[in-house]
Structures are given as structure tokens and as C-alpha cells.
Interface confidence: medium
């Protein structure tokens, strides 16, 4: 139904709360180089604003677009020209262009800082002085870092940042308290971040058909008893929630997440019987809880695949008649009794058999034709499955850190033209996808690794776009989104690659790596793999092998001597002569 | 917000030593880190040292370690950076800055809030 004022009608249902904070995340992911105190100004402002429309619905500009109200304040900041450049050229523009040309400013890869974390004392006194603020800072940090962050589930991690808090300040060792429950809400947030950036990415490069054909495939494995019209519903719905927060409307996003959590609460019967544990929870864990609740149990009399896709008269018919229909039925039926597979290879056999159907059906005997289709998903679902086999083998022969190299020589070999960090950057977290998955039952490993690995890979291609160096890496990340992971694996070794010259301030370390913590140590140490890598493409796995053993052996020594300066000084050059000579 | 003060400045022989102050109002200092920068003409922000919020980390920059000293006071907000063995190319505008949080932080963007700067000139 329509309302009078939009404004006043969000901070009714969402809160006060949830609305400073919803609207905070969205001028920190439109503006993210504004300091806190600038934006917590402009959201006191909003809110004040949306609490005089609340009072009367038809009092100036109550009635005006989210869109429009949100852009004139942010459009009204001092300076925004000498510090976000042509986006101030956005502020020209009238609505709906004027924040499409927001969206399109939003930097994927922003020049801060990283966001460190306080002292355990620091953080518990600046927590207890004032909650709201220090609450605001943390999504403030991450929204700006961070421009695609699904907003719900941001204020869920803010949540749960604070039941931490509020827990481990109490505590007498509030250090050992924190820091594994952050790292943990951390490592959950960073992953939550990619996937949902990948979403956005479907829907703005191949629109909402793509999305919704994603939800399908992913609602119809967790919610198998559930019918194609109840699956159809939900997709519609979730793509729109989606697109909103895709779009920057995250006020609007938040409060249609919860209606669909209501929804889904008060039909648990038709949709699953797996839902009550999270229905009982309050709104941001209930809706977190349902979007990653656990697969129901399938119906066990589901009938072979092939009587109404292949053997079914009909086929061609039924497909002319209604081609999405059909094949939404196909990939629902397909992907409810594939729980063990990746949404991304359900949707490349979706795609196989679009492509055979539409070759087929134009022949003089289809069935002759697409008889065979079935067969022909073999090797799509072999490759996947061998990758994951190789790959947890490697995963739990070398452990993280060793199977994180190795994924650095195979990626650096593939496009050795890409910036060094961004190679490190790419290998640590196609890396963590042996702890991630390797370690979890042998029917959920292929969904967890090819799903994770598609979203590290999507970042891979967002961040090239910015600067293409890679003609494989355009080649890649060219195509449609369920063919990237495929087509990176196939790489191989860029024989157009012309070496880097070995310099020998690249191998050059002091003293004050020692002092690093074991994080940054490791990024040492791979961005000094990645440089032997561009220096000589083909060396074998046993010379780079031998030279980061000996490299190891160096910062051990040095590390541990007395006078580090002048092992490092000494030692230093010896390494470098000596890896030449490893890699001659 | 923070209001940052430097004071101290001033000219220095070769050798010699020197002690800036930073006074902080406003908002609560407590949880903040603060940083001692400096600049000089056409050359980018350095940072020189700074202090977390209670006073248990001090940090350095490599070009002042073992010379500059942080330290600080919270009861009466104030951080002081004692410079000996002061050369002519210690010569710069002295910042000193704050950082929300408690990190060791050592880039400038990691700041929110900074004085106006102290002239400090190292003659030979």
C-alpha cells in the first residue's frame, strides 16, 4: 500500500534503532571517506527529520523519495569535491540518475587503512562510556570498507559485537575473552561480505532473472518438501530484498528481510520442518538463522529426474509454451534432490539443458536428440568434484598456510601481470576454502568449496576491472558468473608473460619483520613468493620449494640473533646470491 | 569532537634536545590512540611515535627510534614527545593527532583528529 511519507513510514517499522543504524551504513557505503563524526551528524539529522514526518505525515518534504532526501543531504556536505571528486558531479543529476551515479562510485577496493582492533582495556572503557557510539564506529568502519555489506546482517554482526562486549568486559582476562570471539565474528563477516558482494554482482551484470534462478536453485535444496510455487514465492521475494540492498536502499531492504522472515515463520508447514529454532529468536538473529538454516530432509519418494524432462513426450512442447516456467521447474527439481552439489554447477546444468532443448527441439526428432542430456551432465559434475578431491588432498597434506602458497604459484603462474597484493590477497582466501570446507561431511564439501571459491573469485574480477592487466583474467572473468570458476581453473601458465627482472631490493628484509605478528610475517613471505614466481614463471614446485625453506631458515636465524641488525645486513645478500642461484 | 594543542616548538642547535606537548579537550580522551606526526616542505606526513590510550604501548617510526620519547598523561590529557640528538633533518611541522579505538596505528588516515602543528627548525 502506498503511505503519505516513506520516511515516516520505515522508522515506524523499523525502529529508531535499526533506522540511525540502517542509515548510517548507507552514507558510509556511499561516502567512504567521511569521518564518523560527519556522518553520525547527518543520521542525527534524518532522524530528526523522520520523527517530525512521524508527527505529521504531510509536513514539508515528508513526502519526498528516500532517494531524494537522502541524496540532498549527502549532496549538502562541504567539500565533496575536493574529496570525492566526480562523484560531486552525481549531485547535478536529478532522481533516479542521481543515485545510480552514487552506486556507481561505490569503491570496492578504498585506499584506508585496515581496520585494527583496539586493546581489550581500550575497547571495554570506550564501549562502557558510551555503547551507541562505539556501536556506531563499528559500523561506520565496516560499511565504508566494505560498500556492498548486506545492511541486515551488518547490524546482526553489530549485535553480536555487543553481546561480546558485554560479556567479555565483565571478565577479569578480558583480552583472552575477546579476541577469539571477534576473530570469530570477524572471519564470518569478511565471508558474508564477499558473498553478498557477489549477489550484487549477478543482479547488476546479468539482472534479476540471474538472481532469481540463483535462489531458486539455493531455496530449493535447503527447502526440498516445499512445492514449485511456495520455491517461486520465495526467490521473488529474496531477489527483491536483494536488489534493494544492492540498490542502496537499505532501509527499505531491512524492513522487506523481515516481513519475508514473518512470512516464512508463519508457513513453516508448507516450506520446512527445520525453522522452528529460528523462528523463536528475536528479528536479526531469526532472519540470520533462516538464511543459513540446515537442509531439510528430502521426500523420499521423489521420482527419477528423467520422466518429465527427458522421457515426457511433451518436453519440447511444455518448453515452447513456457520456457522459464519450465526451466524453473527443472532447476527445482534438479536442485532438490542435489543438496550435495554447488548452486553454481546446478545452474551450469540448468544452462546445459536450456542449450540442449533449444538445439533439440528445433531438430526433426527431439527425443532422439535431448535423449541423451542427462548423460551429458556427467563430465560438468565430474570437474567440480575432481577439483575438490585434488584440492582438500593438497588442503590436508600442506595445511593452510602451505596450501595458500600453493594456490599463489598456480594463480601468479595463471596471470603473473596482477599486482602482487592482489595475488596475496586472492591466494589467503581461496586458501582458507581447505579450513573452510575440507573438514565438514563428505556430501557438503563441493557446495561449501565451489560457492566460496565463485565469491573470492568474483573480488578477483572486481578488483581487475579497476585496472585490467590480465587478458586471462578478462577472459575469465568476461563470461557468465557460474563459468568463472571453471574457466580460472583451466588457466594455465601465461606463456605471453615476459619475466620481471630479479631485483634484489624486492628479497631484501630487516630487522622489523621479527617484531611483525605472524599474520603479516606470512604476507611477507607470500608477496616474496609471488615476485620469485614473476621473476621466473616456470620454476619448478622443488626449486620455489627450496628457496622459501631457505628464506624460512634465514628469518629464524636472523630473528633469533643477538644482533639482528647486522644478521639481516650480513645474511641478507647471501639469501638473495643464493636464491639466484636455486632459481637459475 | 577532540581539540588537539601542540606547543614546545622552536629553534634547536644540532645535538640538542627538545620536549612538545599535546593538551586534548573536548570529547573523552580515554579511548583514543594519539600520534605524533611530522612534515616537513614537500615531503609526505611522517609518522614518529605514538601512545595507546592508557599509555601501556608506545610505538616508534624507524627514522626517530631510540631518540624520541612518547609518553602520556590521562589525567591531564596531555602527550609529551622528548626529542634528543636532534639533526637539521628533524626540521618540520610537529603534529600530534588522535585515532579513535586503542591500534597501533601508524597511518595518518587512521587519524580523526589533529592539532594545528609546532614549527621545530634543527640549526647546524
Known amino acids: 500500500e502506498a503511505h503519505k511519507s516513506e520516511i515516516a513510514h520505515r522508522y515506524n517499522d523499523l525502529g529508531e534503532q535499526h533506522f540511525k543504524g540502517l542509515v548510517l551504513i548507507a552514507f558510509s557505503q556511499y561516502l567512504q571517506k567521511c569521518s564518523y563524526d560527519e556522518h553520525a551528524k547527518l543520521v542525527q539529522e534524518v532522524t530528526d527529520f523522520a520523527k517530525t514526518c512521524v508527527a505529521d505525515e504531510s509536513a514539508a518534504n515528508c513526502d519526498k523519495s528516500l532517494h531524494t532526501l537522502f541524496g540532498d543531504k549527502l549532496c549538502a556536505i562541504p567539500n565533496l569535491r575536493e574529496n570525492y571528486g566526480e562523484l560531486a558531479d552525481c549531485c547535478t543529476k536529478q532522481e533516479p540518475e542521481r543515485n545510480e551515479c552514487f552506486l556507481q562510485h561505490k569503491d570496492d577496493n578504498p585506499s584506508l587503512p585496515p581496520f585494527e582492533r583496539p586493546e581489550a582495556e581500550a575497547m571495554c572503557t570506550s564501549f562502557k562510556e558510551n555503547p551507541t557510539t562505539f556501536m556506531g564506529h563499528y559500523l561506520h568502519e565496516v560499511a565504508r570498507r566494505h560498500p556492498y555489506f548486506y545492511a541486515p546482517e551488518l547490524l546482526y554482526y553489530a549485535e553480536q559485537y555487543n553481546e561480546i562486549l558485554t560479556q567479555c568486559c565483565a571478565e577479569a582476562d578480558k583480552e583472552s575473552c575477546l579476541t577469539p570471539k571477534l576473530d570469530g565474528v570477524k572471519e564470518k563477516a569478511l565471508v558474508s561480505s564477499v558473498r553478498q558482494r557477489m549477489k550484487c554482482s549477478s543482479m547488476q551484470k546479468f539482472g534479476e532473472r540471474a538472481f532469481k534462478a540463483w535462489a531458486v536453485a539455493r531455496l530449493s535444496q535447503t527447502f526440498p518438501n516445499a512445492d514449485f510455487a511456495e520455491i517461486t514465492k520465495l526467490a521473488t521475494d529474496l531477489t527483491k530484498v536483494n536488489k534493494e540492498c544492492c540498490h542502496g536502499d537499505l532501509l527499505e531492504c531491512a524492513d522487506d528481510r523481515a516481513e519475508l522472515a514473518k512470512y516464512m515463520c508463519e508457513n513453516q508447514a508448507t516450506i520446512s520442518s527445520k525453522l522452528q529454532t529460528c523462528c523463536d529468536k528475536p528479528l536479526l538473529k531469526k532472519a540470520h538463522c533462516l538464511s543459513e538454516v540446515e537442509h531439510d530432509t528430502m521426500p523420499a519418494d521423489l521420482p527419477a529426474i528423467a520422466a518429465d524432462f527427458v522421457e515426457d513426450q511433451e518436453v519440447c512442447k511444455n518448453y515452447a509454451e513456457a520456457k522459464d516456467v519450465f526451466l524453473g521447474t527443472f532447476l527445482y527439481e534438479y536442485s532438490r534432490r542435489h543438496p550435495d552439489y554447488s548452486v553454481s554447477l546446478l545452474l551450469r546444468l540448468a544452462k546445459k539443458y536450456e542449450a540442449t532443448l533449444e538445439k533439440c527441439c528445433a531438430e526433426a526428432n527431439p527425443p532422439a536428440c535431448y535423449g541423451t542430456v542427462l548423460a551429458e551432465f556427467q563430465p560438468l559434475v565430474e570437474e567440480p568434484k575432481n577439483l575438490v578431491k585434488t584440492n582438500c588432498d593438497l588442503y590436508e597434506k600442506l595445511g593452510e598456510y602451505g596450501f595458500q602458497n600453493a594456490i599463489l604459484v598456480r594463480y601468479t603462474q595463471k596471470a603473473p601481470q596482477v599486482s602482487t597484493p592482489t595475488l596475496v590477497e586472492a591466494a589467503r582466501n581461496l586458501g582458507r576454502v581447505g579450513t573452510k570446507c575440507c573438514t565438514l561431511p563428505e556430501d557438503q564439501r563441493l557446495p561449501c568449496v565451489e560457492d566460496y571459491l565463485s565469491a573470492i573469485l568474483n573480488r578477483v574480477c572486481l578488483l581487475h576491472e579497476k585496472t585490467p592487466v590480465s587478458e586471462h583474467v578478462t577472459k575469465c572473468c568476461s563470461g557468465s558468473l557460474v563459468e568463472r570458476r571453471p574457466c580460472f581453473s583451466a588457466l594455465t601458465v601465461d606463456e605471453t608473460y615476459v619475466p620481471k627482472e630479479f631485483k634484489a631490493e624486492t628479497f631484501t628484509f630487516h630487522s622489523d619483520i621479527c617484531t611483525l605478528p605472524e599474520k603479516e610475517k606470512q604476507i611477507k613471505k607470500q608477496t616474496a613468493l609471488a615476485e620469485l614466481v614473476k621473476h621466473k614463471p616456470k620454476a619448478t614446485a622443488e626449486q620455489l620449494k627450496t628457496v622459501m625453506d631457505d628464506f624460512a631458515q634465514f628469518l629464524d636465524t636472523c630473528c633469533k640473533a643477538a644482533d639482528k641488525d647486522t644478521c639481516f645486513s650480513t645474511e641478507g645478500p647471501n639469501l638473495v646470491t643464493r636464491c639466484k642461484d636455486a632459481l637459475a | 569532537e577532540v581539540q588537539l594543542v601542540e606547543s614546545g616548538g622552536g629553534l634547536v642547535q644540532a645535538g640538542g634536545s627538545l620536549s612538545l606537548s599535546c593538551a586534548a579537550s573536548?570529547?573523552?580522551?580515554?579511548?583514543?590512540?594519539m600520534g605524533w606526526f611530522r612534515q616537513a616542505p614537500g615531503k609526505e606526513r611522517e609518522f614518529l611515535a605514538g601512545v595507546t590510550w592508557s599509555g601501556s604501548s608506545t610505538f616508534y617510526g624507524d627514522s626517530v627510534k631510540g631518540r624520541f620519547t612518547a609518553s602520556r598523561d590521562s589525567a591531564k590529557n596531555t602527550v609529551t614527545l622528548e626529542m634528543n640528538s636532534l639533526n637539521p633533518e628533524d626540521t618540520a611541522v610537529y603534529y600530534c593527532a588522535a585515532a579513535y579505538g586503542g591500534g597501533l596505528y601508524r597511518d595518518p588516515r587512521s587519524y580523526d583528529y589533529w592539532g594545528r602543528g609546532t614549527q621545530v627548525t634543527v640549526s647546524s
Open positions: 573536548g570529547r573523552t580522551f580515554s579511548p583514543y590512540t
